[in-house]
Amino acid sequence: EPPTACREKQYLINSQCCSLCQPGQKLVSDCTEFTETECLPCSESEFLDTWNRETRCHQHKYCDPNLGLRVQQKGTSETDTICTCEEGLHCMSESCESCVPHRSCLPGFGVKQIATGVSDTICEPCPVGFFSNVSSAFEKCRPWTSCETKDLVVQQAGTNKTDVVCGPQDRQR
């Protein structure tokens, strides 16, 4: 009797269990009572990444330099191209279809995690004892200067945006 289900890597068509095409190949013709499934390799700029019965291969992703993209990994007949962003930029979304500049951490904030091609800068507020007086995508919060170690005294307290100001100790005469 004609099958109602087929084995793994097969598909049912016209009461026949036909072999699927392997990754990197597309379907040219279904199997028949007398012939195997016929498959053809995907062309240079195309791919299929699963066992399939697709009659067309998928086009490799284009890493558009106008959108700040560059090729991280070249596609093969079995894999898509992987794009990443140029230096100083990161992906706008998980699919990485375009890039945006890394965010800078404003004064009072330091870099907790430097941006990558796929993730933006993560900033954190400078805690007490630390400061950042620049807008930067790289600088962490820096500790206030320790006046004591320089044999100086605090003349002006530090904030999250400014360092302490040290001065000489008043000498008793």
């Epitope: 072999s19 040219v28 013709s29 279904d30 028949t32 009572e33 007398f34 012939t35 195997e36």
Partner: antibody, heavy 112, light 112 residues
């Protein structure tokens, strides 16, 4: 329902070329399958001659050497057989077939 | 070329009795995908061949279930569980795993 129908002259002179056509209805020959020519000399068994594929490529029985050509006319949904330099041993019923479906066959006699 | 040898060449059977035809191949008919393209055809007197069994054991649509096929590699069998009057004719095996396709020489089934 797939149907195949052979047509062509029933008498061919020795050394001439035998030409037959197979008209297919109920299925487009460019979709899939191998489209075969098979012959059967009177009172004998079946002999596979060759096929043309849905994509126009073909394969022939080496026993027929360079005498055989199978071609396709997609506009008419038919395929044809040409067998050159025929002799009396080419006298047979000629069938066109998809193998699951066959024509009714046509007798070709080679005689002067 | 692959040679298919059928036995017996003549098979007299009593109505209602079983019948068995053997087809042996000169080389394995199993391809690299594990499929075996061995088919059985019936040719009634004065008619075109008719597909009974494809890929060793699959009955073609409309074929009575008294017909069954079995075997693997180089050894294949067609069985008729209970012969009926309409089963009279010649039975052929055909392999389409290797080009050129080849037929067995045929087994003539007749009623005793």
């Amino acid at each position: 329902q797939v149907q195949l129908q052979e047509s062509g002259p029933g008498l061919v002179k020795p050394s001439d070329t035998l030409s037959l056509t197979c008209a297919v209805s109920g299925y487009s020959i460019t979709t899939n399958y191998y489209w075969n020519w098979i012959r059967q000399p009177p009172g004998k068994g079946l002999e596979w001659m060759g096929y043309i594929k849905y994509d126009g490529s073909n394969n022939y029985n080496p026993s027929l050497k360079n005498r055989i050509t199978i071609s396709v006319d997609t506009s008419k949904n038919q395929f044809s057989l040409k067998l050159s330099s025929v002799t009396a041993v080419d006298t047979a019923v000629y069938y066109c077939a998809r193998l699951d479906y066959w024509g009714q066959g046509t007798l070709v006699t080679v005689s002067s | 070329d692959v040679v298919l040898t059928q036995s017996p060449l003549s098979l007299p059977v009593t109505l209602g009795q079983p019948a068995s035809i053997s087809c042996r191949s000169s080389q394995s008919l199993e391809n690299s995908n594990g499929n075996t393209f061995l088919n059985w055809f019936q040719q009634r007197p004065g008619q075109s061949p008719r597909l009974l069994i494809y890929k060793v054991s699959n009955r073609f649509s409309g074929v009575p279930d008294r017909f069954s096929g079995s075997g693997s590699g180089t050894d294949f069998t067609l069985k008729i569980s209970r012969v009926e009057a309409e089963d009279v004719g010649v039975y052929y095996c055909l392999q389409v795993t290797h080009v050129p396709f080849t037929f067995g020489q045929g087994t003539k089934l007749e009623i005793k």
